[in-house]
């Protein structure tokens, strides 16, 4: 796998754009030190590689965009892991450094003779990676060399800080917005007491921090907050689940600012421990509407409400992708490995034949079978187009009236490219406007998804609402079918007439016991009983005091 990690997908061009995609799953805990990546990924990996290759083809054949300039790329595998992505980013940088030295005539062979080899072209910008934690690490390196980075799914709020991440931009909004959307859902259903889980790492930590801050302001209490690594072992997930059960039946809702594989880990633990149906998971866009999260664990996921960045499927990508075959697709170096993994068969006689599969792949296999487009495909493509439009605008201003790369543009200055990128404004792949604010962020709109059992053993995600610019719209009937089905997630029920709340020492404000006021007391506020003054008595509703009417006794009155 370490040699596999050095596999690179190349596409020649006048200008080279780098890309980092999670072609493989992250290393498991025991393999981290070796940086040995996991299995090949389709949606987050192969589809994104193919999207890059095909989008560049479309850009190159568009006469109105970068005329006379061919865009190429160098795609590397991040394995959704900082150490691997950094190693790969250093390769990008090394290309740039060798290239710039060559420009200055500094490339010399060891024996002192001048070099005759043509080194690789420098990387002018980088698309990706997907994970916020990984993107931060990569940005820390890229910005030292003025290389702009455009992310398609790194949504951490921290990345909005331009003093720290100057060369970072994204075609997705900051997580502050989805944290708000999650709080709005919790508020809508009067869930005042919820458990919280987040993935260890920047995405989960900053997202959960925002969720907790906003919850506190809205009077929502967090029963307990837990964090876990996405690649944690079964034992860790089991322990976390057992801890979550200790807050049942009060905290039935679990807000999960989690990467998809963390959610999957939770679902698998629910299966192992027999906890299906005990919790309602409210998931962030790391889960969204991904089938790789729920596959095989649908019963455990039923009822889940998730946030999804709005991004419709890209039809032209499917038209291209579904025709791909291992015999003809040579430019994607991971494709044969993926094909064998996808169909669990061996590509006999192929360079990457995998002998672990007994069955031989037959020629009738097609990617159309069980095809699901990556839910962030639109963002990946928009990120690539953003780079193209940024370069286009730069060329227009530096090379007026010139088609192609003029001297003023060579070598490409990262500072000028960043300036140009920040001003980019174009119509995205789904007809939406792509633009960047002063923090390099894009405006966002979310869809609210609900994972449901649609029929016997048939499960799917249903769009049940949207969150746009602070406004939540939900189809409650679609989520709950009837009002009485709405899950309760509260610590204490409201007190009855004449009772006050007593919050136990060390408890959160949502947990109380109800205590009745004494006979001569009224409810002053929800936490205090007050005695009526002499000569007065609590009113019937116990919210104040009435004077006791004076009764004069006469000699002839019977005894009271």
């Amino acid at each position: 796998q370490s040699s596999e990690r050095r596999v690179v997908a190349h596409m020649p061009g006048d200008i080279i754009i780098g890309a980092l995609f999670s072609v493989h799953h992250q290393p498991t805990v025991d393999k981290v030190h070796e940086r040995k990546c996991g299995a090949v990924r389709e949606q987050y990996g192969i589809q994104r590689v193919e999207a890059m290759l095909h989008t560049l083809e479309r850009i190159n054949s568009d006469p109105t965009l970068l005329p006379n300039i061919t865009l190429g790329c160098e795609i590397r595998d991040s394995c959704w892991h900082s150490a691997v992505a950094l190693e790969q980013s250093i390769e990008f940088i090394r290309d740039s450094l060798i290239s710039s030295e060559e420009e200055e005539g500094l490339v010399r062979c060891v024996d002192g003779s001048s070099s005759s080899f043509r080194s690789k072209k420098p990387i002018v910008g980088v698309i990706g990676p997907g994970s916020s934690s990984v993107a931060i690490q990569v940005q820390n390196l890229l910005q030292l060399f003025n290389i702009p980075q455009i992310a398609y799914s790194a949504t951490s709020m921290d990345l909005s800080d331009k003093t720290l991440f100057k060369y970072f931009m994204r075609v997705v909004p900051s997580d502050a917005q989805q944290a708000r959307a999650m709080v709005d859902i919790v508020k809508r259903y009067n869930w005042t007491y919820v458990s919280a889980v987040h993935t260890e790492g920047n995405y989960g930590e900053s997202g959960m921090e925002a969720f907790k801050d906003m919850s506190a302001k809205e009077g929502i209490c967090i029963a307990h907050s837990y964090k876990i690594y996405s690649n944690a072992g079964e034992q860790s997930f089991d322990k976390l689940l057992k801890k979550l059960t200790s807050h049942l039946p009060k905290a039935r809702v679990v807000a999960c600012f989690c990467e998809g594989m963390t959610v999957r880990g939770l679902l698998m633990a629910m299966r192992r421990l027999g906890l299906a149906g005990e919790f309602l998971l409210l998931g962030s866009d790391g889960w969204a509407d991904r089938y790789d999260v729920t596959d095989g664990y649908q019963r455990e996921a039923v009822g889940g409400i998730t946030i999804k960045l709005q991004s419709p499927d890209v039809k032209w990508f499917d038209d291209y992708y579904l025709k791909l075959r291992p015999e003809t697709n040579h430019r994607n170096p991971w494709f044969q490995e993926f094909w064998q993994h996808r169909f669990q068969c061996r590509l006999e006689g192929f360079p990457q034949e995998n002998s672990k599969y007994n069955k031989t792949c037959n020629s009738s296999l097609t990617l159309k079978t069980h095809h699901v487009q990556d839910s962030k495909m639109g963002f990946v493509i928009n990120a690539i187009y953003s780079m193209a439009y940024g370069l286009h605008n730069m060329q227009m201003s530096l090379c007026p009236g010139y088609a192609g790369l003029c001297d003023a543009m060579k070598p490409i200055d990262g500072r000028k490219l960043l300036e140009s990128l920040m001003k980019t404004n174009f119509t995205g792949v789904s007809g939406d406007t792509i633009l960047f604010d002063e923090n390099g962020d894009s405006p966002g709109r979310y869809e609210i998804m609900n994972f449901k059992e649609m029929g016997k053993d048939y499960f799917d995600y249903i769009n049940v609402g949207s969150w746009d610019n602070g406004e939540l719209k939900m189809d409650d009937d679609e989520v709950w079918s009837k009002k009485s089905n709405i899950i309760r997630s509260v610590c204490s029920e409201p007190c009855e007439k004449g009772q006050i709340k007593v919050i136990r020492k060390g408890e959160v404000s949502c947990c109380w016991t109800c205590t009745p006021c004494k006979e001569n007391e009224y409810v002053f506020d929800e936490y205090t009983c007050k005695a009526c003054q002499l000569g007065s008595w609590p009113t019937d509703d116990l919210t104040g005091c009435d004077l006791i009417p004076v009764q004069y006794l006469r000699w002839g009155d019977p005894e009271p």
Partner: antibody, heavy 115, light 110 residues
Amino acid sequence: SVEESGGRLVTPGTPLTLTCTVSGIDLSSNAMGWVRQAPGKGLEWIGIIYASGNAWYANWVKGRFTISKTSTTVDLKITSPTTEDTATYFCARDATATWDYFNLWGQGTLVTVSS
Amino acid sequence: AYDMTQTPSSVSAAVGGTVTIKCQASQSISNWLSWYQQKPGQPPKLLIYRASTLASGVSSRFSGSGSGTEFTLTISDLECADAATYYCQQGYSVANVDNAFGGGTEVVVK
């Protein structure tokens, strides 16, 4: 408190329902389990009903028992008793809403299955 | 399956002595293990939960230890009243369980 009732002598195949009546226990907060003990044998876990109403059973149960509940009772239905089901049946309260440990037990009710 | 094996099935010791009972889980159950005492004609009584926490009202002569798959119940300073059968129970998972309880250990006090 927890009290089992309904145990009696039945012939094989005659369905029987045992009832566990609770007082001072909120069945919407605590799980309740059923455990049986054949004469001179050890404890055998049958199943549990969570506070949520979801029920789980031991692998060997395979539809022979059904656990259900109301706000104050937990029922164990023996669908088609066999002589092997002769035992004292205990109802017990779990300390949590799901599955952990039993901190309150009933005295048990004896079921005898014989032809 | 999460199944429990208890050893020995019977043990005898003198008053004032110490008895150790072992319980092994077929797979790791962290510390979700409890111990019960049962006397003839009575229901089981909780002694220890979460492997080592003493239930309220239980003598400190009873102690529990272990985590993962290996657990131990120790009764020190043995008294006649300790003569009973002792059971361990996993409280980890209800999925794929044959019996949540161990087979039991009879303690005879001489």
